[in-house]
């Protein structure tokens, strides 16, 4: 069976996000992957989208992330743009209205995105074979 075009877009966006660090990719997010054994795929995507939404809602105008130079400001705006695109596509793939995120574990945004990229690539390899 064919891979969803949304999945390809998600992987492309994750590649863009994980290639370069910004001032705020070292900030922490809820690590939904730490204990996700009894979670369905759709729930995982939904919860990942929720985590990303929480992050960009909280940090979009964070002065620490916006930085002191126009260059840093530009990079943060690009980061937020990609996170919003990723959020939107994950919701589309999840097909759920809402999902709880209660984990206490934290990971950096950078590590969170790398883990999500691994999961998405595994999903892509299954659906493309």
């Amino acid at each position: 069976h064919k891979c969803d075009i949304t999945l390809q877009e998600i992987i492309k966006t994750l590649n863009s996000l994980t290639e370069q660090k910004t001032l705020c990719t070292e900030l922490t997010v809820t690590d939904i992957f730490a204990a996700s054994k009894n979670t369905t795929e759709k729930e995982t995507f939904c919860r990942a989208a929720t985590v990303l939404r929480q992050f960009y809602s909280h940090h979009e105008k964070d002065t620490r992330c916006l930085g002191a130079t126009a260059q840093q400001f530009h990079r943060h705006k690009q980061l937020i743009r990609f996170l919003k695109r990723l959020d939107r596509n994950l919701w589309g793939l999840a097909g759920l209205n809402s999902c709880p995120v209660k984990e206490a574990n934290q990971s950096t945004l950078e590590n969170f995105l790398e883990r999500l990229k691994t999961i998405m690539r595994e999903k892509y390899s299954k659906c493309s074979s």
Epitope: Q20, F73, H74
Partner: antibody, heavy 123, light 106 residues
Framework: QLQLQESGPGLVKPSETLSLTCTVS??????????WGWIRQPPGKGLEWIGS???????DYNPSLKSRVTISVDTSKNQFSLKLSSVTAADTAVYYC???????????????WGQGTMVTVSS | DIQMTQSPSSLSASVGDRVTITCQAS??????LNWYQQKPGKAPKLLIY???NLETGVPSRFSGSGSGTDFTFTISSLQPEDIATYYC????????FGGGTKVEIK
């Protein structure tokens, strides 16, 4: 494809203001994913970044030139400009304009450059 | 300001030789490091971006490596058309170019 072209006087007198314009063709200067920069190269020497201007109109300047540099953009003409005040012979150089940034990356190098224009500071 | 120290400043090699240029940053710049080629009378051309990525259309004999403060640019088999000056450039915090390396044929 996108092209950049510098224009302006090739000779400027000491203490006056050097003014150059970069015209962008084959694409819009208004994309929020890209930014625009000026780089110079004195004869027989290396490259020196002068400054950059972003979609929002915000700018970054080389700290060593900051007090003398102004970069502005005119979206209606698809142009951006450089003004360098109080010039001396040390400002004699080839001046390049360039595009940075990317739509599919957080940031990218200056990947498209103009051909450069030689500016001589002399009385 | 971040300083970029490039070496050697010039080198002479034979066609087919492996050529290596190094660039050292005065502080950690992650992978925000580019390599440009400039031929006499021409504008610089981007060859490698983010330390190791080959720009579209650039021959595969050009490569880059490194992260943090130490970076290397390699031409695996020098060709006559590679005669040029090569510059590294950091864009981690604003922009700084290395001093350049002039590559000549023996």
């Amino acid at each position: 494809q996108l092209q950049l072209q510098e224009s302006g006087p090739g000779l400027v007198k000491p203490s006056e203001t050097l003014s150059l314009t970069c015209t962008v063709s084959g694409g819009s200067i208004s994309s929020e994913s890209y930014y625009w920069g000026w780089i110079r190269q004195p004869p027989g020497k290396g490259l020196e970044w002068i400054g950059s201007i972003y979609y929002s109109g915000s700018t970054d300047y080389n700290p060593s030139l900051k007090s003398r540099v102004t970069i502005s953009v005119d979206t209606s003409k698809n142009q951006f400009s450089l003004k360098l005040s109080s010039v001396t012979a040390a400002d004699t150089a080839v001046y390049y304009c360039a595009r940075g940034g990317a739509s599919d990356r957080i940031d990218h190098a200056f990947d498209i450059w103009g051909q450069g224009t030689m500016v001589t500071v002399s009385s | 300001d971040i300083q970029m120290t490039q070496s050697p400043s010039s080198l002479s090699a034979s066609v087919g030789d492996r050529v290596t240029i190094t660039c050292q940053a005065s502080q950690d710049i992650s992978n925000y490091l580019n390599w440009y080629q400039q031929k006499p009378g021409k504008a610089p051309k981007l060859l490698i971006y983010d330390a190791s990525n080959l720009e579209t259309g650039v021959p595969s004999r050009f490569s880059g490596s490194g992260s943090g403060t130490d970076f290397t640019f390699t031409i695996s088999s020098l060709q006559p058309e590679d005669i040029a000056t090569y510059y590294c450039q950091q864009y981690y915090d604003l922009y700084t170019f290395g001093g350049g390396t002039k590559v000549e044929i023996k």
